[in-house]
Interface confidence: medium
């Protein structure tokens, strides 16, 4: 199996992780994309994802996670604001392309968040109590993808996953009201 490389980010509590996942523009511009965490001894879990189809430059906020897909540049921008120590871990970007397996984007992100004075901005961030005013998304199904009668998301390669949402629409009343899809199914 190919050893996936990792890119390490060391940030303080309160700062913002700001990463860009590159993808092949022609193949994946409108594909749905997701941000996943890989916890030791567990399956990857999807924390947030773009809409289906993915909209150009349209920010989606899920709790403290903000995704923006820039079709023109072939990159997914991921921000995690107001970082907490417990956010430390291994993350990856994934592109959903049913009925084929999802496509993982390299490199994985090893995030290390430490306690400390966060008044000093991180290497790529103005400090921390930034409040991102992003309107909540109103899509019917967020992470899951097609299947009838329920929507489904397949798992990333070599992980155990697939997911679906209930038949009813997900009503988003605020920016935290978006499901996280654990990608073991």
């Amino acid at each position: 199996a190919t050893k996936l490389t990792e890119e390490k980010y060391e940030l303080k509590e309160g700062q913002t992780l700001d990463v860009k996942c590159d993808y092949t523009l022609e193949k994946f511009a409108s594909s749905q994309k997701a941000w996943q965490i890989i916890r030791d001894g567990e399956m990857p879990k999807t924390l947030a994802c773009t809409e289906r189809p993915s909209k150009n430059s349209h920010p989606v906020q899920v709790g403290r996670i903000i995704l923006e897909d820039y079709h023109d540049h072939g990159l997914l921008r991921v921000r995690m604001v107001n970082l907490q120590v417990e956010d430390s871990g291994l993350y990856q970007c994934v592109i959903y392309q049913p009925p084929k397996e999802p496509h993982m984007l390299f490199d994985r992100i090893r995030l290390v968040v430490t306690k400390g004075f966060s008044g000093t901005p991180g290497s790529n961030e103005n400090s921390t109590q930034n409040v991102y005013k992003i309107p909540p998304t109103t899509t019917k199904a967020l992470c899951p993808l097609y299947t009838s009668p329920r929507t489904v998301t397949q798992a990333p390669p070599k992980s155990t996953a697939d997911v679906s949402t209930p038949d009813s629409e997900i009503n988003l009343t605020n920016v935290t009201d978006i499901i996280r899809v654990p990608v073991f199914n």
Partner: antibody, heavy 118, light 113 residues
Amino acid sequence: QVQLVESGGGVVQPGRSLRLSCAASGFTFSSYGMHWVRQAPGKGLEWVAVISYDGSNKYYADSVKGRFTISRDNSKNTLYLQMNSLRAEDTAVYYCARRSSGDYLDVWGQGTMVTVSS
Amino acid sequence: DIVMTQSPDSLAVSLGERATINCKSSQSVLYSSNNKNYLAWYQQKPGQPPKLLIYWASTRESGVPDRFSGSGSGTDFTLTISSLQAEDVAVYYCQQYDVDPLTFGGGTKVEIK
């Protein structure tokens, strides 16, 4: 209609083997992770095992690790649980269940009874 | 493993009255980055398989009557039946799905007084 139907239960002696099946219909079986959950008579629910949508990953409860094997045949829309070295404490109703948008279980079969007794 | 503790073990409530079931997890099932609680509630009637009622601690599964509601966060959760109906007689289980293995509470039997 989304449906899961278990079969293969019965009475078996300790130390013997049994294979349970779960036939899925009404949804794209090959896209879903699947679980086995059991319930001893008069007791609560106990998670047994889970398999990924493509069968590449499997996880087991400590109580069955090394004795039970979960598998699936996506071409037949069927989930299996091979149970070896059965013990009296494995006596239970065995349910297959579909994993949904979280790890919660949104569709359950009716269950099949396994009795391990000499 | 996360231990799920339900209380009470059984509950007798008059028709039309409120029934409240508590569930406590041995560690938080709240995922801070997306603010979701990884807790579900199931109903199991005699001779039937469990049925999903609530997920993400407070989201009702489609088709579940609105007299059922879930609340709580972190480690303490509650399932409330606002006005008990005869068909609600069942055992109710909470389940965490944040950390493997998935674990269930011991169940609460709801009966009519």
